[in-house]
Each structure stands twice: as structure tokens, then as C-alpha cells.
């Protein structure tokens, strides 16, 4: 697999860079804050619930809109401008790990907390089947980690 | 040697529902994405549903979407398609196929359809 | 969704000929998604070539593969009679499609 990775690597290099995952990092932020607001809770607060309803990725937020279609219905603008952008990786799973895990990497410093960090990821692992395009199996989101190896 | 047995099989009516399990040996079962394929008599391959090594991901073809559900249970190296709502068009071989997905650095990629059951035979007639 | 259009839909050939089969995708996709099966009657399929050019284990290598970018093809450079079978290429670099696929038969 060494040679598809080489030449993945410089055209999935360009990709980022030529992409603009602002978008992303705003319309997530908005969301967890939104979920915070609109369920109360604090997140400082380390005896959290981890299944509280806003975690649960099968009910959503009330206030939310609801997932991004490529219609566009009811979505909001920077979700729509997000899942334009991610749709550029959509026919390269291991571009689509590294936007993720840029994604991450630009916001870690402004999640207050390990609780709405958690949520982030969430959201974030969550983000490729909102835009209707398919997620690698699995992406490490851990900023500051080496990864696990299966082989 | 990857093995992988299908059951569950058999004639329904239009309508009902239906489910095949998948019976997998040979190799490291939760580390691998289980996918289903279906053949209909005569015709080509159609992929079907995928869940991943950790079941934390499930995807559907438009063709099934609510309608079937895919599930697994790593405890008992088992993955099951629960088909409801069957309809003719439904008639087909469903194989169960082993993605022999790629892992690196903490991250694991869809992979080759690598390894395939022997299939099992749906028929939905009136 | 991508799709992959398969050509001929029928080759007939001899034994020992040269069976050259054709893929094409609907997009560019890299050819580390591309993949091709060989399904005889009654049987599951079996994986032939993965990553568009590369046998999968227990091949033999009078099967190749190649092609880049939409065009990719399966080469069986000397047709042995155990080779008449249907082959299906497939992709996985945007969901999961298979060609409708190529049947070799004896000629």
C-alpha cells in the first residue's frame, strides 16, 4: 500500500490545504452550545450523564436542524458550506480522517472541559453521515495520541 | 481459515419479514467490518448493508433503508440481517463478506471484500 | 454513486487465448478502491485483484490488472478452461458498486 500512500498523501495534502474547514469547526461549536443551552447543563460539571438525550445520537436537539441533505432543507448555512467542503474527500477515506482530525486539532484548545470535548467528537465522528457521505470506520480523534495499531 | 456460514434462508411472502445470521470463524472477528451482498437469480451483485468492526457504524443501500437492519454480536462471532417488509424484488442469494479493512495509526479504513460465505437463498413469492 | 460499466457483456473465446475485459467508472477513483471477482455458476464470487493491479493470494499470474483514473482493465493472458466464469470489477472509494459484469465463455 506504500505507493498509494505516497502519491494519497501529496493530492490529500493539497485538498487540505486548498479547503476551508471553518465552516465545520463553526457549525459544531454552535451545536454543542445550542445542545448545552437548550438541555441546561453545565460543562464544567464532571458527573454529566454520558447518556443524556443530547448525547444520544439518535434524538437530536428540538432546536436543532435536521441533518444536512444535499438538498439543503432546513440546514443551517454553515453546515451546508461544511458538507460542500468535506464532500471534496468524500472518494478518499484517508483525506477524510485528516479533515476530521484537522478539524479537531483547530478546535481542542477552545473545548472547555473533557465533557464537551467528548461531545465535540461526537459530533465530529458523527459529521461525514450528516453531509450523506460515508465515514471511515474508524478516525483518531485523541490530539495528543500515537493511535492503536491492529496490525 | 476464514469461514463464514450464512442461515436463515428460506420462502416468505411479500410483506413478512425474515432474518439470516452470519456465523464467522478463522480470524479475529471484532476486528473486522461485516458486510452483506445479494445476487438475484441470473443478475449481477448488489451491495446491501456494511457494520463496522465495532458496530458503531451501519450503512445502507437506498434499496433497504428502513426496511432492513443489520446487527452483530462479537461475543458470538455473529452478524444478522433482519429483513422486513419483503418484497419480490428481494429475491435474491445473500452472501455475508468479510471487509478486510486497513488499520493505521489509530485509524481503520473500508477495505477489499476479502473473504465471502457460501450465501443463502431468499425467495419472496406469493 | 459511482457507477461501473462493464464491457463486453459477453467474450467469447478458446482456451488458451488472451481474454482482455473492460471497467470503466462514472468518476475518477483511486485505483487502491478498485477491485475484481471471478464468480463461477453456483459459487460465491472470489477476490481476483485488489488495489486495481494486484493478485489476492493463490492467483495465478496469467491473470493481471491494470488502468488508472475511470478505465481499468482485466487481463487473463492465456485462458485455461477452469478461467470461463463471470468477473465482476467493484469500487469502494465512494460506497460499495459492482459492474454488471462480464461472462467469458468457450467460444
Known amino acids: 500500500r506504500q505507493q498509494w500512500e505516497l502519491q494519497g498523501d501529496r493530492r490529500c495534502q493539497s485538498q487540505l490545504e486548498r479547503a476551508n474547514l471553518r465552516p465545520c469547526e463553526q457549525h459544531l461549536m454552535q451545536k454543542i452550545q445550542r445542545d448545552e443551552d437548550s438541555y441546561g447543563r453545565d460543562p464544567y460539571s464532571p458527573s454529566q450523564d454520558p447518556y443524556s438525550p443530547s448525547q444520544d445520537p439518535d434524538r437530536r436537539d428540538p432546536y436543532s436542524p435536521s441533518p444536512y441533505d444535499r438538498r439543503g432543507a432546513g440546514s443551517s448555512q454553515h453546515q451546508e458550506r461544511c458538507c460542500n467542503e468535506l464532500n471534496e474527500f468524500e472518494n478518499n477515506q484517508r483525506c477524510m480522517c485528516e479533515a476530521l482530525q484537522q478539524i479537531m486539532e483547530n478546535q481542542s484548545d477552545r473545548l472547555q472541559g473533557r465533557q464537551q470535548e467528548q461531545q465535540f467528537k461526537r459530533e465530529l465522528r458523527n459529521l461525514p453521515q450528516q453531509c450523506g457521505l460515508r465515514a471511515p470506520q474508524r478516525c483518531d480523534l485523541e490530539v495528543e495520541s500515537g493511535g492503536r495499531d491492529r496490525y | 481459515q476464514v469461514h463464514l456460514v450464512e442461515s436463515g434462508g428460506g420462502v416468505v411472502q411479500p410483506g413478512r419479514s425474515l432474518g439470516l445470521s452470519c456465523v464467522a470463524s478463522?480470524?479475529?472477528?471484532?476486528?473486522?467490518?461485516i458486510h452483506w451482498v445479494r445476487q438475484a437469480p441470473g443478475k449481477g451483485l448488489e451491495w446491501v448493508a456494511v457494520?463496522?468492526?465495532?458496530?458503531?457504524?451501519?450503512y445502507y443501500a437506498d434499496s433497504v433503508k428502513g426496511r432492513f437492519n443489520i446487527s452483530r454480536d462479537n461475543s458470538k462471532n455473529t452478524v444478522n440481517l433482519q429483513m422486513n417488509s419483503l418484497r419480490p424484488d428481494d429475491t435474491a442469494v445473500y452472501y455475508c463478506?468479510?471487509?478486510?479493512?486497513?488499520?493505521?495509526?489509530?485509524?481503520?479504513?473500508?477495505?477489499?471484500?476479502?473473504?465471502w460465505g457460501q450465501g443463502s437463498l431468499v425467495t419472496v413469492s406469493p | 454513486e459511482i457507477v461501473l460499466t462493464q464491457s463486453p457483456a459477453t467474450l467469447s473465446l478458446s482456451p488458451g487465448e488472451r481474454a482482455t475485459l473492460s471497467c470503466r467508472a462514472s468518476?475518477?477513483?483511486?485505483?487502491?478502491?478498485l477491485t475484481w471477482f471471478q464468480q463461477k455458476p453456483g459459487q460465491a464470487p472470489r477476490l481476483l485483484i485488489y488495489?486495481?493491479?494486484n493478485r489476492a493470494t493463490g492467483i495465478p499470474d496469467r491473470f493481471s490488472g491494470s488502468g488508472s483514473g475511470t478505465d481499468f482493465t482485466l487481463t487473463i493472458s492465456s485462458l485455461e478452461p477452469e478461467d470461463f466464469a463471470v468477473y465482476y470489477c467493484?469500487?469502494?472509494?465512494?460506497?460499495?458498486?459492482f459492474g454488471q459484469g462480464t461472462k467469458v465463455e468457450i467460444k
Open positions: 478463522g480470524f479475529t472477528f471484532n476486528y473486522y467490518a
Open positions: 463478506v468479510r471487509d478486510g479493512e486497513y488499520c493505521s495509526g489509530g485509524n481503520c479504513y473500508w477495505g477489499d471484500f476479502d473473504h
Open positions: 488495489g486495481a493491479f
Open positions: 467493484q469500487q469502494y472509494a465512494n460506497w460499495w458498486t
Open positions: 468518476q475518477s477513483i483511486s485505483s487502491e478502491y
Open positions: 457494520v463496522s468492526f465495532d458496530g458503531n457504524i451501519i
